[in-house]
Amino acid sequence: MAPWPELGDAQPNPSKYLEGATSQQPITPDKSKETNKTDNTEVPVTKFELLPTYSTATLIEEPTEVDDPWNLPTLQDSGIKWSERDAKGKILCVFQGIGRLILLLGFLYFFVCSLDVLSSAFQLVGGKMAGQFFSNSSIMSNPLLGLVIGVLVTVFVQSSSTSTSIVVSMVASSLLTVRAAIPIIMGANIGTSITNTIVALMQVGDRSEFRRAFAGATVHDFFNWLSVLVLLPVEVATHYLEVVTQLIVESFHFKNGEDAPDLLKVITKPFTKLIVQLDKKVISQIAMNDETAKNKSLVKIWCKTFTNMTQMNVTVPSMANCTSHSLCWTDGIQIWTMKNVTYKENIAKCQHIFVNFHLPDLAVGIILLIISLLVLCGCLIMIVKILGSVLKGQVATVIKKTINTDFPFPFAWLTGYLAILVGAGMTFIVQSSSVFTSALTPLIGIGVITIERAYPLTLGSNIGTTTTAILAALASPGNTLRSSLQIALCHFFFNISGILLWYPIPFTRLPIRMAKGLGNISAKYRWFAVFYLIIFFFLIPLTVFGLSLAGWPVLVGVGVPVVFIIILVLCLRLLQSRCPRVLPKKLQNWNFLPLCMHSLKPWDAVISKFTGPFQMPCCCCCRVCCRVCCLLCGCPKCCRCSKCCQDLEEGQEAQGVPVKAPETFDNITISREAQGEVRAPDSKTECTAL
């Protein structure tokens, strides 16, 4: 088990490594560089040389006066001041603003829709398998297995509400006890945090942006993992969640409510149901060991059906099974009786793309997975671009101050709790923590929201998603009301307990520190982000699942040494950083281990070797896409990948050596003359650069 990898080469003061930087042009953050195209072109620009040893991201991203890479970038206003505009310019500026707002809302809408379709795609690809996970009898006795099943199923179906509703129906039909369901709910809480981590991966193109976005997304993961790490053993030992929720449920005087509010779904459903509609009951039926459901398709074909109660002739094994003594006969071969059966008549087909294709679920799932990821990625890029152009100068200052500033003393501590309430409220409105946290991720990336502020918003989001579940439980039918309410309350109190553990005392805000650490590593070795995703959401849960199936002795036999090594490494790491003198000289650092066990550098070299051959075609594709993008938006400077690809090609021609994979996406700062993209701004039409 290697210790937490360190950022060996991160430079605290980038200005030391810059030559020829003039006072006329400070090294601005990348965001402002990108949007600075309307500046007066007469400003002298000095080309500076970078000393070769360090990654350009570390040197360029942050301003010279800033030491902390986590400080938000200055989003400079490059537009013409309002007072300097003529009437036509002002009108155009207003229209441009409205246009941007409409575009932003449009892309946000499709972003949310693509998340919904992505969830459907995952259900089509892995839903049936997810259902079969639940029908495993070992869940009852093994809380650890329950936990990983919760994680895996939620990851596979990309929806904690789907996995939770399966659990509810299983508890309601006595296939699962509430005690056995609690670890699954905890696992579902972890699994749901993968969505915004995937969204963060979309911002991999810009190192500093990616550092912030990835840390902002994984703060959710770490909160959930740490909460489970503490609360699962506590729950297994004391059953406090089960006991507390049972007391609450028993104090209720049940009366079936009305349907839970749909809110955001009201807007997105009309569009997403034109793409695909799923029969969610199938997954639940598989989980409840219904053999017939295994052959059913998840893709809904008939949307309008008529259910009629009718007397039907059915075969029975013997006369004893006849519904009534008189209504029984034989045709000489089979014994028949009359039974009241509900007969479902199909009236109208659904109106979605896949209704008449009769493709297997896997095929539909893969098609939707690709499309939804492309739309998600495209929308995210456009949202980031539009926000980047809108959130500058005064607007940026106001927004950043509003979101990130604390209340005046002595009420500063209340700000975070207000953020928790805001997060809960927003999640309740959008009816999905995934949607809220995924929308938050690009804002963290571009520097509008700090990670310190994103953390309570995310915690609030966790609470918000449980209030939705409580409302849905109160609206559920009598047979599932008790179990669904108890499970929803377990989910709620689990998140409340997690907040009490990891938020009130600033010292305990461990998820922030862990997420920042991961953000730093992922910014330097971007492949590590994908590794983290695979390891934490797939490999570890699947390994635990496999070991649990093998039985407790195997799980303990493998688990105890692994946990022991992790604790040993953590203790050693703590002593190394706090009081290294206590340790023998050899243990004061990790150099006694092979390099590959305490640094990602050797691994980076290996991965670069594998990814090297894919860089050229990737870059060619990137350049074509960028040029098209530039033509469409009419902005020749928005596109940075073509330059980096050019450098890559030149480097390869000169040396015949493949360039390291992570550098492919670096933002190389060059003068505008060198780019050959100098153009005088149209003072009349340009409000702020898109």
Partner: antibody, heavy 120, light 107 residues
Framework: QVQLVQSGAEVKKPGSSVKVSCKTS????????IHWVRQAPGQGLEWIGG????????NYKQNFRGRVTLTADKSTSTAYMELSSLRSEDTAVYYC?????????????WGQGTTVTVSS | DIQVTQSPSSLSTSVGDRVTITCTAS??????VAWYQQKPGKSPKLLIY???TRHTGVPERFTGSGSGTDFTLTISSVQPEDVATYFC?????????FGVGTKVEIK
């Protein structure tokens, strides 16, 4: 219209076997059960057995088991009854009749009958 | 096996008369009884099923009744074309069994 047309009369020696066919038309063969009933001269009706052509499930009266085989050919909508180890008491008119599957309407259509004479 | 006994074994009647044929099952058969008509030299024809339901195309003068063990077939007004042998059949349990038949003649 509904028709069940049986093969012609047969004269057989004791110990031999006879195969009677029943070609159907005018209805969905697989939706019905085909029964075989015999009538000895001057006697009542005796049920032999039945077959569901859709899945080839059969049932026979106890005293015919092992001697009778009912088959059905879906492609030609034809049912067959083979009776082996013939005895003189097997001399009778053999009828095929249809019975609507999953329905209690009994044998609503009959073939014209096939006379089987067993004599040495 | 369920035994089905029919009475009378034969009867002679006049055109326009009312005729009743009875059928008794050895055990309760509910309403799983059918009546067939077999004219001389012809194959049987279904008249009544489920004890009282008239088959398609069967004249209204034929009515069936009864449940449990006792069943009757009534011809309200005998016509010359009704000269035939009438069989009752139970289909409550396998094997399917028939009555010996009632021969109806016109004087």
């Amino acid at each position: 219209q509904v028709q069940l047309v049986q093969s012609g009369a047969e004269v057989k020696k004791p110990g031999s076997s006879v195969k009677v066919s029943c070609k159907t038309s005018g209805f969905f063969f697989t939706e019905y059960i085909i029964h075989w009933v015999r009538q000895a001269p001057g006697q009542g009706l005796e049920w032999i057995g039945g077959i569901i052509p859709n899945n080839d499930v059969t049932n026979y009266k106890q005293n015919f088991r092992g001697r009778v085989t009912l088959t059905a050919d879906k492609s030609t909508s034809t049912a067959y009854m083979e009776l082996s180890s013939l005895r003189s008491e097997d001399t009778a008119v053999y009828y095929c009749a249809r019975w609507r599957n999953a329905y209690y309407s009994a044998m609503d259509s009959w073939g014209q009958g096939t006379t089987v004479t067993v004599s040495s | 096996d369920i035994q089905v006994t029919q009475s009378p074994s034969s009867l002679s009647t006049s055109v326009g008369d009312r005729v009743t044929i009875t059928c008794t099952a050895s055990q309760d058969v509910g309403t799983a009884v059918a009546w067939y008509q077999q004219k001389p030299g012809k194959s049987p024809k279904l008249l009544i099923y489920w004890a009282s339901t008239r088959h398609t195309g069967v004249p209204e003068r034929f009515t069936g009744s009864g449940s449990g063990t006792d069943f009757t077939l009534t011809i309200s007004s005998v016509q010359p074309e009704d000269v035939a042998t009438y069989f009752c059949q139970q289909y409550r349990t396998s094997p399917l069994t028939f009555g010996v038949g009632t021969k109806v003649e016109i004087k």
